[in-house]
């Protein structure tokens, strides 16, 4: 932190390493929940025109795709990976790409991904060829 920039006691707006370097915040698509036409595709664009600066530098980009009997929605937000989102841990927060993984939610099909490169939640990937994690 520069000497002329005052330190604050409880500061979650600023992430620093041991040398005092400051982390730049993530730039993420941030349209909250919108109706989507993304269905049965290997990947989709978010069609979100809003790229926001995440409020806290530790936050990453998140996308949530949900399908039920009535509609399909895509949610794009910033979120702190230390905290659960929709009751799920963001396991893939360090990934540069947003690789969708299915989560168990009663009454709907629910996929979620997180990533940590600029606007990475603009391109959401469902294709198995990108997913190198174990199938279980």
């Amino acid at each position: 932190i520069p000497p002329h920039v005052q330190k604050s006691v409880n500061n979650d707006m600023m992430v620093t390493d041991n040398n005092g370097a400051v982390k730049f915040p993530q730039l993420c698509k941030f349209c909250d929940v919108r109706f989507s036409t993304c269905d049965n595709q290997k990947s989709c664009l978010s069609n979100c025109s809003i790229t926001s600066i995440c409020e806290k530098p530790q936050e990453v980009c998140v996308a949530v795709w949900r399908k039920n009997d009535e509609n399909i929605t895509l949610e794009t937000v910033c979120h702190d990976p230390k905290l659960p989102y929709h009751d799920f841990i963001l396991e893939d927060a360090a990934s540069p790409k947003c690789i969708m993984k299915e989560k168990k939610k009663p009454g709907e099909t629910f996929f979620m991904c997180s990533c940590s490169s600029d606007e990475c939640n603009d391109n959401i990937i469902f294709s198995e060829e990108y997913n190198t994690s174990n199938p279980d």
């Epitope: 520069p2 390493d17 370097a21």
Partner: nanobody, 124 residues
């Protein structure tokens, strides 16, 4: 020597406007994403707005979106922040900062990445 020099701060009434400037020298301005960052008294840094080096693509924090406009003049090596509809919570020291493509962390040295700041006070 890298220098970032902010100006344009001052006292303004709620609902008023200010235009901040940041004069850059000592580096290739057109290679850097530029930021406005602010720090309210006793608070942490808040990243307000950013602009790409070429193409002038802009980004805003949700707290200022629709009220603030960032711009740059690459021919003058200058960054601007037009602040409209100012609120008491916008009171802070405003800094400009620079970011190389792909850079995730910023060194703490004020000479490398930070200006000295300009104080904006919004009060009636």
């Amino acid at each position: 020597e890298v220098q970032l020099l902010e100006s344009g701060g001052g006292l303004v009434q709620p609902g008023g406007s200010l235009r901040l400037s940041c004069a850059a020298s000592g580096f290739t301005f057109t290679e850097y994403r530029m930021w406005w960052v602010r720090q309210a008294p006793g608070k942490g840094l808040e990243w307000v707005s950013a602009i790409e080096p070429i193409g002038n693509r802009t980004y805003y924090a949700r707290s200022v979106d629709g009220r603030f406009t960032i711009s740059r003049d690459n021919s003058k090596n200058t960054l601007y922040l037009q602040m409209n509809s100012l609120r008491a919570e916008d009171t802070a020291v405003y800094y400009c900062a620079k970011q190389m493509p792909g850079q995730k962390w910023m060194a703490k040295s004020r000479f490398d990445y930070w200006g000295q700041g300009t104080l904006v006070t919004v009060s009636s």
